[in-house]
């Protein structure tokens, strides 16, 4: 068997077979050593005793999107069935004190690989045996410790192959360069050690894209905005907005990268070479956002112009275009290529609470000598929208611990003035939280309070 | 002069619907909260239901949430409770009032009466 | 069962002072502002108090209302035949996000 009739059905075309090698694979047309690695079936009964006391699940994941030319990195990771768990020497243990279906167990091992290999191996005296070897034959890499790797994973996409030997986890980077755009298919086979020979345990598959485009991602951020997820911001408030570019191999760590952001309110283009911008809408509305992000990357040349054409034919020259030269690339050519990236949102402005101040402290006299408790009034004066709710949230001097937290439905006027009044425990300095809020927005100040003991001759005071 | 005049109350089946109306006039109808507020015959105050001005944030009492929706209309002045799987204890007599941390103001009220 | 409780009946001669409670918790009155209601027989409730212990225009000050950690008071001194009626205390509720009334008192003039 070949390794395409085992690992897949997705088969590329001859087309893709020849352009795009990536480096380090090998192509599938390989052949498959089916004794070491049997091949089943999907539905084969062989499955359920592939792994003992239970299936184990791959799972794979990637870093996709990934933009032409830079790194892509797969992740499989092996969940085992439960109570089970890989320790440092690469041996399948049973975690302590955990039950499963079958209880408690005795042995210690679900699969004790440091015991097989040390009286299973006939090698020779390079340390190679036969059977330590990955399904195209070639000799498992022999660094620190692949003794206590029992895993084998078979990567194969695009028509080409990858083996790996592993742990309970690996990553495998592969160079998007050659790759065709668009969403591609990775598909994983795992093996475990299995005395002489290999057992399959999981297959996983995972669609990947690769792409022309700079994968672009936007956050917004607002002082006093209630929710930042729902594109609706305030007038007359900085919105901050900050580019996130999808790039986890650093691709472009060296490019320029240029912004150019139209806010969609007539306040025309605005290029930058800072990630972040800060833009006011100073009327209510819907407005859309458009970003366009331009990158200098790394990426092919272009073939060199054709040799000018003589007038006359000349037969030494033989046929134009057989040159075999004339299209090829040189080497150690270090060109760019100018990459984009696009982000569109259309975002809601609308009025609300854009500020609010304590502007005055009162401590409430009590009709009773000597209370328990002091009353304090917070008089408030806020910007903006009219709140419909106030907070306040009382912690220990650090502003770290509450204590207290009380909502209530507040009715202000134009003015937007109003008057807080709040129960403090005993004498004490507090951290006072005041928010005002109403459906879009949630404004917040603070202050430190000094309550004093129950002296009437002691006055209340601002603490900062 | 503060006026809030309810409308819609009347006799009903369990399990139907009625939807109260309230008319405000003499103030910025816009810049205040409402609030629904009925009093079961011979029984005391019981709070129904409260809407901030812009209609964005509602709140309801445990009895009738889920049932009950309140609303209202900035540019008609009027305030909404829309009642439905009405229960024989919902009958009261349903007052309109502005505001909601406190009931400033209060309307004549409308009686509603749940009963087969 | 209502959240604040108020006595079912207070009772007065003209003249006198009559002080009704209302007693709650810190999720209500303890932290919010109380207000006091009055219903007069067949009509519709007033607002008597807000903030505690503030009277809207048009009460005379014969009410006022006091507050001391999660009680609240309505006092009525020189009372006339006319405070006859029902009185309620309410407030907002943090916890029960619910606005809470007392079961009402209801004040007897005697004489």
């Known amino acids: 068997k070949r390794f395409h009739d085992v690992l897949g059905n997705e088969r590329p075309s001859a087309y893709m077979r020849e352009h795009n090698q990536l480096n380090g694979w090998s192509s599938d047309e390989n052949d498959w050593n089916e004794k070491l690695y049997p091949v089943w079936k999907r539905g084969d009964m062989r499955w359920k005793n592939s792994w003992k006391g239970g299936r184990v699940q791959a799972v794979l994941t990637s870093d996709s999107p990934a933009l032409v030319g830079s790194n892509i990195t797969f992740a499989v990771n092996l969940i085992f069935p439960r109570c089970q768990k890989e320790d440092a020497n690469g041996n399948i243990v049973y975690e302590k004190n955990c039950r499963n279906e079958a209880g408690l167990s005795a042995d210690p091992y679900v699969y004790n690989w440091t015991a097989w290999s040390e009286d299973s191996d006939g090698e020779n005296g390079t340390g190679q045996s036969h059977h330590n070897v990955f399904p195209d034959g070639k000799p498992f890499p022999h660094h620190p410790g692949w003794r206590r790797w029992n895993f084998i994973y078979v990567f194969h996409t695009l028509g080409q192959y990858f083996q790996k030997l592993g742990r309970c986890s690996v990553r495998v980077s592969v160079n998007t360069a050659n790759v065709t755009l668009g969403p591609q298919l990775m598909e994983v086979t795992v093996y475990r050690r299995h005395g002489r020979a290999y057992v399959p345990i999981a297959q996983v598959k995972d669609v990947y894209v690769v792409t022309d485009q700079i994968p672009v991602f936007v956050t917004m951020f607002q002082k006093n905005d209630r929710n930042s997820s729902d594109e609706t911001f305030l007038k007359d408030l900085p919105i901050m907005f900050d580019v996130l570019i999808h790039d986890p191999s650093h691709f472009l760590n060296y490019s320029t990268i240029n912004y150019k952001w139209s806010f969609g309110d007539n306040t025309g283009l605005f290029v930058s070479t800072n990630h972040t911008v800060n833009h006011t809408y100073v009327l209510n509305g819907t407005f859309s956002l458009n970003l366009t992000v331009k990158a200098a990357a790394p990426g092919p040349c272009p073939p060199p112009p054709p040799p000018p054409r003589p007038s006359k034919p000349t037969p030494s020259l033989g046929p134009a275009g057989d040159n075999p030269l004339e299209l090829s690339r040189i080497p150690d050519e270090n060109c760019q290529i100018n990459r984009y990236g696009h982000f569109q949102a259309t975002i809601t402005i609308v009025e609300g609470i854009l500020e609010v101040n304590i502007i005055q402290m009162t401590d409430v006299l009590m009709p009773v000598p000597w209370p328990e408790s002091s009353l304090i009034d917070f008089v408030v004066t806020c910007q903006g929208s009219i709140p419909t709710e106030v907070c306040t949230i009382i912690s220990d001097p650090t502003c770290e611990i509450t204590q207290n937290t009380v909502c209530s439905p507040v009715d202000v006027d134009e003015m937007c003035l109003l008057t807080v009044r709040r129960t403090f425990n005993g004498s004490g300095t507090y951290c006072v939280n005041l928010t005002l809020g109403d459906d879009t927005s949630l404004a917040l100040t603070s202050t430190l309070i000094s309550v004093p003991d129950r002296d009437p001759a002691s006055p209340l005071r601002m603490a900062n | 002069e503060v006026q809030l005049l309810e409308s819609g109350g009347g006799l009903v089946q369990p399990g139907g619907s009625l939807r109260l109306s309230c008319a405000a006039s003499g103030f910025t109808f816009s810049n205040y909260a409402m609030s629904w507020v009925r009093q079961a015959p011979g029984k005391g105050l019981e709070w129904v239901s409260s809407i901030s001005h812009s209609g964005g944030s509602k709140y309801y009492a445990d009895s009738v949430k889920g049932r009950f929706t309140i609303s209202r209309d900035n540019s008609k002045n009027t305030l909404y409770l829309q009642m439905n799987s009405l229960r024989a204890e919902d009958t009261a007599v349903y007052y309109c009032?502005?505001?909601?941390?406190?009931?400033?103001?209060w309307g004549q009220g409308t009686l509603v009466t749940v009963s087969s | 069962q209502s959240v604040l409780t108020q006595p079912p009946s207070a009772s007065g001669t003209p003249g006198q002072r009559v002080t009704i409670s209302c007693s709650g918790s810190s999720s209500n009155i303890g932290n919010n502002y109380v207000s006091w209601y009055q219903q007069l027989p067949g009509t519709a409730p007033k607002l008597l108090i807000y903030?505690?212990?503030q009277r809207p225009s048009g009460v005379p000050d014969r009410f006022s209302g006091s507050k001391s950690g999660t009680s609240a008071s309505l006092a009525i001194s020189g009372l006339r035949s006319e405070d006859e009626a029902d009185y309620y205390c309410?407030?907002?509720?943090?916890?029960?996000?619910?606005?809470?009334f007392g079961g009402g008192t209801k004040l007897t003039v005697l004489g």
């Open positions: 903030a505690d212990s």
């Open positions: 309410g407030a907002w509720d943090s916890s029960l996000n619910a606005y809470v």
């Open positions: 009032a502005r505001k909601w941390s406190t009931f400033d103001y």
